[in-house]
């Protein structure tokens, strides 16, 4: 799986989108999990409604929300009041039984609030990617890694 980088500003909300094949994943609940290292386990943060037909209803766990457009095939995760500790590797998952398919791997990066001068030294201002080599910029908030790219990056 390629990894897509989503950058958000500290204190603001970040929306992460995970597109998927709506037919292939028909009837499946979805989940958002936090990965503990690139090869580590993925800890469930939040999952969609227990009733698949109600997956469009937004579900919250703390400051993280999930909603699923099952017809359009887009899972959307919202991280509210983004903080430095929210940085890390995540996965969008499609659940079936006790198994989970990875829809997208996501690296969340937290940028400094340019209007907040008090902690300007504590957060990273947007600029060159420090985590990945030759990262492809898709949008202002996300970019994808090319196949086989190593996150040339963050540690334990």
């Amino acid at each position: 799986h390629n990894t897509t980088v989503f950058q958000g500003v500290a204190g603001q909300s970040l929306q992460v989108s995970c597109p998927y094949d709506s037919m292939k994943h028909w009837g499946r609940r979805k989940a958002w999990c936090r990965q503990l290292g690139e090869k580590g386990p993925c800890q469930r943060v939040v999952s969609t409604h227990n009733l698949w037909l109600l997956s469009f209803l937004r579900r919250w766990n703390g400051s993280t929300a999930i909603t699923d457009d099952t017809l359009g095939g887009t899972l959307t995760i919202t991280l509210r009041n983004l903080q430095p500790h929210d940085a890390g590797l995540y996965q969008c998952q499609s659940l079936h039984g006790s198994e989970a398919d990875t829809l997208r791997k996501v690296l969340v990066e937290v940028l400094a609030d340019p209007l907040d001068h008090r902690d300007a030294g504590d957060l990273w201002f947007p600029g060159e990617s420090e985590s990945f080599e030759d990262a492809h910029v898709e949008h202002s908030i996300s970019r994808s890694l090319l196949e086989g790219e190593i996150p040339f990056p963050p540690t334990s």
């Epitope: 936090r34 990965q35 503990l36 290292g37 690139e38 090869k39 580590g40 430095p84 500790h85 940085a87 890390g88 590797l89 690296l107 990066e109 937290v110 957060l123 990273w124 201002f125 420090e130 985590s131 190593i150 996150p151 040339f152 990056p153 963050p154 540690t155 334990s156």
Partner: antibody
Framework: QVQLVQSGAEVKKPGASVKVSCKAS????????IHWVRQAPGQGLEWMGW????????KYAPKFQGRATITADTSTSTAYMELSSLRSEDTAVYYC?????????????WGQGTLVTVSS | DIQMTQSPSSLSASVGDRVTITCHAS??????LSWYQQKPGKAPKLLIY???NLHTGVPSRFSGSGSGTDFTLTISSLQPEDFATYYC?????????FGQGTKVEIK
Amino acid sequence: QVQLVQSGAEVKKPGASVKVSCKASGFSIEDFYIHWVRQAPGQGLEWMGWIDPEQGESKYAPKFQGRATITADTSTSTAYMELSSLRSEDTAVYYCHADHGNYGSTMDYWGQGTLVTVSS
Amino acid sequence: DIQMTQSPSSLSASVGDRVTITCHASQHINVWLSWYQQKPGKAPKLLIYKASNLHTGVPSRFSGSGSGTDFTLTISSLQPEDFATYYCQQGQTYPRTFGQGTKVEIK
């Protein structure tokens, strides 16, 4: 019991090569990244490089690029670090270190260390 | 490479003291910082990962804080077994780099 067991101490002449092994027990090395870190006598820790045994891909600190070779044999769950063109300043304890990689790994295992002495 | 600078290089303290060690990164490293403890003749042991997360089995008197470029390791009440050398290590980019170490000695 989860552990990394390294090969024994070595004494080498300048210009020679040394190959240190690191055998994992209690876990499979494919599920981890294996790093090599060295520590010269009375000095701090220095990261040398890393291998993903599952993919066979390795990365090195610029200082060791071309002189260090990190390999892994998944069938025996053993990682190796070979250092060539040895000089006296390579005298150090060499550690292997396993973790789940970047972005918040909660797994962290170290070998007991292998002392490599380079002396004429 | 990202340079990691620890201070102080060494300190003397008594059992029960509150000890603070700082680590400064030459570039922004977000929260990708680990703290290790090393005793003479032994391999390093992970104390803190991701700047502030306590590793399994590590006593709660150890704590970490910081993000960006400045980080702190605090030992709230120094115990006899805490006399050792402490290293920070960044994980924002490879090569991973360590601070030069802080030796905590008995006063």
